[in-house]
Interface confidence: low
């Protein structure tokens, strides 16, 4: 059994934990319908640009179909996943499966997300995961709003090979990409991590029913959620331990792809979809 929540971040460096201002943080407010309409052409282009992405998507698509076929028997199980929320489409499920699969995709994707916000031009011309970014963002929004009442979660995240340094006590920070965490303390500690996070998240959504590894009780946190550093300690031999509490959200970008496509010639009106 693989433990992807830690394995998805296999780096070996020290990194500043701050507002991650170079990360691409679009929330697609007012342009979800337009983005959805743009997906077929956009995804087709991105498949051509990245074989890892294309392969992961096809594998995830097969897995999604298999899970859909098994849905009737799951509905009888005591540990059955909740039905998808209103508005949740096949491609949301496929995107979550593709992201959580034990393949190089999540690593490539998050590395790209962390850099894609350097400039609008960088996102538009050099970020080849626009489809995946949108689908994951929308999936988390749908899964989050599908919780009744909306819920915050205490989660745990172990990162192997990467030590985070908080900007300072009580600093406001973001995680910089999509961050996988677990409702189970033990799952996050599985690898003898270099950084251990305890996180109170309100925008992260449980994705157990949509993960390749449902046993992990995974929660996925979007890149635009902001946190306050509550406590940070770093022992000489042990892991860095960082405790974060949800503050809210912050995005530098909104609807950049649609603005570029639709708003070059004249005024642009984004809907509230």
């Amino acid at each position: 059994q693989s433990h992807p929540i830690t394995r998805r971040d296999l780096f070996s460096q020290e990194i500043q934990l701050d507002m991650a201002l170079a990360s691409f943080d679009d929330q697609y407010a007012g342009c979800a319908a337009a983005m959805t309409a743009a997906l077929p052409d956009l995804n087709h282009t991105e498949f051509q640009a990245n074989q890892v992405y294309a392969d992961s998507w096809t594998l995830a698509s097969s897995q999604w179909q298999e899970r859909q076929a098994r849905w009737p028997e799951w509905s009888l199980s005591p540990t059955r996943p909740s039905p998808p929320p209103l508005g949740f489409r096949d491609e949301h499920g496929v995107a979550l499966l593709a992201y959580t699969a034990n393949s190089p995709l999540h690593k490539e994707f998050n590395a790209a997300v962390r850099e894609a916000g350097r400039s609008r031009a960088h996102y538009l011309h050099h970020f080849s995961f626009k489809t995946l970014h949108f689908l994951l963002t929308e999936a988390l929004q749908l899964l989050g709003s599908g919780q009744r009442p909306p819920r915050c979660h205490q989660v745990f995240r172990g990162v192997h090979g990467l030590r985070f340094r908080p900007a300072g006590p009580r600093a406001t920070v973001r995680l910089g990409g999509f961050a996988s965490a677990s409702l189970k303390h033990v799952a996050a500690q599985q690898f003898g991590e270099d950084t251990f996070f305890g996180i109170w998240t309100c925008l992260g959504a449980p994705i157990k029913g949509y993960s390749f590894f449902p046993g992990e009780e995974e929660v996925l946190i979007p890149p635009f959620e902001t946190f306050q550093v509550i406590n940070a300690s770093r022992l000489a031999q042990g892991p860095a331990r960082i405790y974060l509490r949800a503050l809210g959200k912050h995005s530098t970008y909104n609807c950049e792809y649609i603005k570029d496509k639709k708003c070059k010639s004249g005024p642009c009106h984004l809907d509230n979809s």
Epitope: D41, H44, A49, Q51, A54, T58, S61, Q65, D90
Partner: antibody
Framework: QVQLQESGPGLVKPSETLSLTCTVS????????WSWIRQPAGKGLEWIGR???????NYNPSLKSRVTMSVDSSKNQFSLKLSSLTAADTAVYYC???????????WGLGTMVTVSS | EIVLTQSPGTLSLSPGERATLSCRAS???????LAWYQQKPGQAPRLLIY???SRATGIPDRFSGSGSGTDFTLTISRLEPEDFAVYYC???????FGPGTKVDIK
């Protein structure tokens, strides 16, 4: 523009293995998925399987035990092997390019395969 | 496994008339995963519509697709002589095809 051409034997004996090749011209085979689809005379279309240029395969569950696909990027070709043939495998076999998701945007002309002793 | 049913099996119309073809899925299908193809005798199928309503490159605007959930429709606003053919819908999450609707000349 991209064109696809199927090649292989028109007649195969029952219990033998069918081998077909699809040659892609007018463009690179790289960065796409490539599928095989068949159509018995007067009937509908049945997807057989797909392969990526990195060798990732995905087969129709009903045919999975008999299907093997491979790709040779240097020759811009991909191939299908279908084993343990019966008369029910008699059909026109098409190769096609997989576009976004799994939509087939470019097709070969098709090749007729008859399984008979 | 999702099963697609097409109706009618055969549609007999005259050139200039409007054709409405139906495709029904046994369970809900994302509209992003439904396509339509046209096949003429002795030829390979040709992609017409993907994502339920987006026309493929080079397809005339008399062809349009609509629908969501389990019910999808292909409409040919004014039949041209070259439009008489068999039309297949496809759920391309699992690469399943419908049995086809034949549009022939009345």
């Amino acid at each position: 523009q991209v064109q696809l051409q199927e090649s292989g034997p028109g007649l195969v004996k029952p219990s033998e293995t069918l081998s077909l090749t699809c040659t892609v011209s007018g463009g690179s085979i790289s960065s796409y998925y490539w599928s095989w689809i068949r159509q018995p005379a007067g009937k509908g279309l049945e997807w057989i399987g797909r392969i990526s240029t990195s060798g990732f395969t995905n087969y129709n569950p009903s045919l999975k035990s008999r299907v093997t696909m491979s790709v040779d990027s240097s020759k811009n070709q991909f191939s299908l092997k279908l084993s343990s043939l019966t008369a029910a495998d008699t059909a026109v076999y098409y190769c096609a390019r997989d576009g976004w998701g799994r939509v087939f945007d470019i097709w070969g002309l098709g090749t007729m395969v008859t399984v008979s002793s | 496994e999702i099963v697609l049913t097409q109706s009618p099996g055969t549609l007999s119309l005259s050139p200039g008339e409007r054709a409405t073809l139906s495709c029904r899925a046994s369970q809900s299908v994302s509209s992003s995963y439904l396509a339509w193809y046209q096949q003429k005798p002795g030829q390979a199928p040709r992609l017409l519509i993907y994502g339920a309503s987006s026309r493929a490159t080079g397809i005339p605007d008399r062809f349009s697709g609509s629908g969501s959930g389990t019910d999808f429709t292909l409409t040919i606003s004014r039949l041209e002589p070259e439009d008489f053919a068999v039309y297949y819908c496809q759920q391309y999450g699992s690469s399943t095809f419908g049995p086809g609707t034949k549009v022939d000349i009345k």
